[in-house]
Interface confidence: low
């Protein structure tokens, strides 16, 4: 801790500029104004002053806003927000996204780090909801961001802000998050027609429901293997061979090289041998002739 | 030199409203903190809120939430009180501050 | 909210002797950046109050050094040595750690 100490005379910083960087801590303790610093800290990223110096002017600006940093302040504080902490950051209210951005781009290039995520968390609460500029912004600096949200947060995405996820997004999230995504997709690109409508759904599937798969093996719209291995496997092994076959198209041959891979190799024991053998694929694992299909989400209810 | 200038005093009757205002001098309007205190006559000081005139954000004491409404305007740097319900207990002095600046007062009274 | 105490309503002083004004906070005043925050502030007669301490021990400008705080957490000191006839008023602390800021009643310094 920098001791408060008289300003030795002629000190007197009259305004924050390159000069600072000679002086010691407790000189730019005894002689920077607090209020002085607050008003200028746009100049501060300018200088380059060592990790102590900065300490001293985050205790600076700690004294004179210990409740948390106005608006103004937080949009300029440049590498010193690197010195905040989540318990620092808490304190905010950070309502402009020109602010956001101004702080992501502080930390661009890193992992996002505990203050990044609380002036998130911060931000997103402030707004009520993951607006669509909002979600721009945030997958721009961290394609991960939508993907690190509880199933929770995400419910609060409202259907309008889907057009901003770009497929790169949603690579890291798993079935619990898509199920929450994928309804809102479903909304918010209901009124394209059948191939753009797919393309745009592609990438949400992992949530879809055995009845959309289901309708969408009536369009014609070649599913990759990819995406198809990404898809429930409780929406999958309802699905006939025949849907199967019309959802993947000419895709449809990649099925032998995933055959012992989920939700292949499930959908494979659901399946008629027999119909199997219609893909021409020598797909094995299926029910033979004369064997009774039984329900076996059922079964695994009684047992 | 930061100066804070308050308005005048003012004599209003029970139920009335009553805006205050204090206008800063010195100092980058949006880069403060506009905190509001009152103090009754012969009485100890307490903090009714205050306002970030960046974003217009507020804060109130409990006991003020329902009765002050606090407002800023860059354009002029100026905060202001808004009092509603008013009655003799809110008759004080309204000191509008910015942490070691404090304004005159403004002393309210109200009386029919 | 945290609950500010100051014990003594009032402290008599002989001029040029020295006197300790008390306060006590129900929680502790110490962030999480290692500074407490406890503002000691001195109303005299007919004035405004005005900033003499800040995070506890932090001479505000233009303050005398024969004013200086101390304490730690929960209980806090302000010590004048050499009391002046100027020094005549009523001290306040506050917390400024937390909303609401709260007050301390007051101690009122008199000359005997």
């Known amino acids: 801790e920098v001791e408060k100490t008289a300003c030795p005379s002629g000190k007197k910083a009259p305004e924050i500029d390159e000069s600072l960087i000679f002086y010691k801590k407790w000189e730019l303790e005894a002689c920077v104004d607090a209020a002085l610093l607050a008003t200028q800290m746009d100049r501060v990223n300018a200088i380059p002053f060592t990790y102590e110096q900065l300490d001293v002017l985050k205790h600076k600006l700690d004294e004179l806003y210990p409740q948390g940093y106005p608006e103004s302040v937080i949009q300029h504080l440049g590498y010193l927000f690197l010195k905040m902490s989540p318990e620092d950051i808490r304190k905010w209210n950070v309502t402009s996204l020109e602010t956001l951005k101004a702080l992501l781009e502080v930390n661009k290039g890193h992992e996002m780090s505990p203050q990044v995520a609380t002036l998130i968390d911060r931000f997103v609460k402030g707004r009520g909801q993951l607006d669509k500029d909002t979600l721009d912004t945030l997958t721009a600096f961290y394609p991960g961001y939508l993907c690190s949200l509880s199933p929770e947060e995400l419910s609060s995405v409202p259907p309008s802000s889907i057009w901003a996820v770009r497929p790169q997004d949603l690579d890291t999230c798993d079935p619990r998050q898509l199920d929450v995504l994928y309804p809102k997709a479903r909304l918010a690109f209901q009124n394209m027609n059948g191939s753009e409508y797919f393309v745009k759904i592609q990438s949400f599937l992992g949530g879809a429901p055995t009845e959309d798969l289901k309708a969408l093996s009536q369009q014609n719209v070649s599913m990759d293997l990819a995406t198809f291995m990404k898809l429930r496997t409780d929406a999958v092994l309802p699905l006939t061979v025949a849907e199967v076959q019309k959802l993947l198209g000419p895709h449809v041959e990649g099925l032998k090289a995933e055959e012992r891979h989920r939700p292949v190799r499930d959908w494979i024991l659901r399946q008629r041998q027999d119909d199997l053998d219609t893909l021409g694929l020598g797909l094995q694992g299926g029910i033979p002739n004369g064997y009774l299909v039984l329900d076996l989400s059922m079964q695994e209810a009684l047992s | 030199e930061v100066q804070l200038q308050q308005s005048g005093a003012d004599l209003v009757k029970p139920g009335a409203s009553v805006k205050l205002s204090c206008t800063v001098f010195?100092?980058?309007?949006?880069?403060?903190?506009m905190h509001w205190v009152r103090q009754r006559p012969e009485q100890g000081l307490e903090w009714i809120g205050r306002i970030d005139p960046a974003n217009d954000n507020s804060i109130y004491g409990p006991k003020f939430q329902d009765k002050a409404t606090i407002t800023a305007d860059t354009s002029s740097n100026t905060a202001y009180l808004h009092l509603s319900s008013l009655t003799s207990e809110d008759t004080a002095v309204y000191y509008c501050l910015y942490f070691d600046n404090w304004g005159h007062g403004t002393t309210l009274t109200v009386s029919s | 909210d945290i609950v500010m105490t100051q014990a003594a309503s009032s402290e008599p002083v002989t001029p040029g002797e020295s006197v300790s004004i008390s306060c006590r906070s129900d929680?502790?005043?110490?962030?999480?950046?290692?500074?407490?925050?406890l503002y000691w502030f001195l109303q005299r007669p007919g004035q405004s109050p005005h900033l003499l301490i800040y995070r506890m021990s932090n001479l505000a400008s233009g303050v005398p050094d024969r004013f200086s705080g101390s304490g730690s957490g929960t209980a806090f000191t302000l010590r004048i040595s050499r009391v002046e006839a100027e020094d005549v008023g009523v001290y306040y602390c506050?917390?400024?750690?937390?909303?609401?800021?709260?007050f301390g009643a007051g101690t009122k310094l008199e000359l005997k």
């Open positions: 929680k502790s005043l110490l962030h999480s950046n290692g500074h407490n925050y």
């Open positions: 010195g100092l980058n309007f949006k880069d403060t903190f």
């Open positions: 506050m917390q400024h750690l937390e909303y609401p800021l709260t």
